[in-house]
Amino acid sequence: AWELTILHTNDVHSRLEQTSEDSSKCVNASRCMGGVARLFTKVQQIRRAEPNVLLLDAGDQYQGTIWFTVYKGAEVAHFMNALRYDAMALGNHEFDNGVEGLIEPLLKEAKFPILSANIKAKGPLASQISGLYLPYKVLPVGDEVVGIVGYTSKETPFLSNPGTNLVFEDEITALQPEVDKLKTLNVNKIIALGHSGFEMDKLIAQKVRGVDVVVGGHSNTFLYTGNPPSKEVPAGKYPFIVTSDDGRKVPVVQAYAFGKYLGYLKIEFDERGNVISSHGNPILLNSSIPEDPSIKADINKWRIKLDNYSTQELGKTIVYLDGSSQSCRFRECNMGNLICDAMINNNLRHTDEMFWNHVSMCILNGGGIRSPIDERNNGTITWENLAAVLPFGGTFDLVQLKGSTLKKAFEHSVHRYGQSTGEFLQVGGIHVVYDLSRKPGDRVVKLDVLCTKCRVPSYDPLKMDEVYKVILPNFLANGGDGFQMIKDELLRHDSGDQDINVVSTYISKMKVIYPAVEGRIKFSTGSH
């Protein structure tokens, strides 16, 4: 038998420095977690203790803090090289700055293979990107070889900016021939490493013949066997075992997100490359693990450029600003309310006596809210904090839509509710009631909108044929997160101001904020 140790991360989202327990900015260093310096300590410890070790990343290193805002991916290449990652799969966020923003800082600089079997380049891009990412890579590990085959969410064109010259194929359809090729080449230990979410990870384990292990990302899934060490609630045991269609037991793993844990999986293979056993658990990278001094010094060196960028206080919050995915992708969250209020405030234009304002409504995809802000830092809010909440560098735009389009959008918001997907809408100037016991496409049972042609604003039922103005992120206006109906049916689209600037201006204007959860989004069951 031959034993392999797989160390893995996913959805690190620019958390190069240690963070607080909820993955926002580190306030009390003695209680902080993660960061590349601490990760390196643990990785090196395991490399010294065990013979056959692979360090893998399942995508979405890009996007999430000021590090990415300033360094645009150069920081990812530099520190992943320093940690000596063995391979990485492309995530959807690796395309946030377009293909060029992936090629120049990362693909050309990485000293490790970057993988995706289901992304195919066409047109002029094909020759430009050739060899810079691979469908698979065979790696030497001790006296053996291991094949790593990559995959990326086929939803990427809806979630990021890959452009028109990359085709995202079905993961299973694309993976099978590559795995078959590896088998033909007598590579009998194969890891699928990718970024399509836990459900797809499990499907790959079930359907792709020849895959021995699946290391995933995208859904921030936390798996754990035994008593979990922090706040994350396990979605299942680690590893999660899937019985494949050809009768094999295939371990599937993921390691939450934000560099808080290091996935640790030990696999035992027989001489024919079959998995005999698998066990492990994510390792919580808490303050009991020291930060590596050399990596930490390098972080501090790179940090200087960031410190000049955005550390002045904009205003204060006296409440916790809940921007967690656990809240904002499932229910009304006060961070969503704050952002929507800022978006409306930024568009106050009293140009007609008949209207208190020309627009009263805001919608905001919950997946676009990327971090909470803790009020226990003297209440201070900085540009840097906001860059972690709204890291995508988008704009808040003005559109005109028919009521019927808005109704479709709100149905889409909850069509697959419960899977922590980003399309769940946060709102302003809208009261919506969902009944999740009804079938998808028929779950919106009440949709009231704030009048504009009125002296005392009040909520009236949405009219299907009426045209409404709505403020929303450009991401939604462009059909992101599956909101194709907005892109296809909008009657007018005017580009707006930078998202972080809109919120920072609002906070500066208000000086002290205290947004609440106030019943904008409700759930009910039964007759209406």
Epitope: F112, P113, G131, L134, Y136, K137, V138, L139, V145, N186
Partner: nanobody
Framework: QRQLVESGGGLVQPGGSLRLSCAAS????????IGWFRQAPGKEREGVSC????????YYADSVKGRFTISRDNAKNTVYLQMNSLKPEDTAVYFC?????????????????????WGQGTQVTVST
């Protein structure tokens, strides 16, 4: 068992020629990118020349361009390195390496990424 076996090394005078062979057993070389690497005493291993399996594209290090030629005979499952106009600085142990991954010949030769299969090497000495 997969093996790469180099042969053809030896002692040669400056300006002379040698032809190195890399024979594979246990796998078909036509599916692999193959590279010749060398390591001189006290120096790092460097890529000399690489050839792909599919389109037979080639790559040469600047130091050997115009003097060395890489070729492959898939029927014999062998890759060759014809070395002409040899110089004393070509003295090194020459290794053959193979990668079934679809890496470019340049990425293989640099090498950008770890290469899975290596031979034991053959000594080439260029001296009067």
């Amino acid at each position: 068992q997969r093996q790469l076996v180099e042969s053809g090394g030896g002692l040669v005078q400056p300006g002379g020629s040698l032809r190195l062979s890399c024979a594979a057993s246990g796998f078909l070389l036509d599916y692999y990118v193959i590279g010749w690497f060398r390591q001189a005493p006290g120096k790092e291993r460097e890529g000399v020349s690489c050839i792909s399996g599919s389109d037979r594209s080639t790559y040469y290090a600047d130091s050997v361009k115009g003097r060395f030629t890489i070729s492959r005979d898939n029927a014999k499952n062998t890759v060759y390195l014809q070395m002409n106009s040899l110089k004393p600085e070509d003295t090194a142990v020459y290794f053959c390496a193979a990668d079934p991954s679809p890496v470019t010949v340049q990425a293989m030769c640099l090498p950008r990424f770890p290469v899975p299969y290596w031979g034991q090497g053959t000594q080439v000495t260029v001296s009067t």
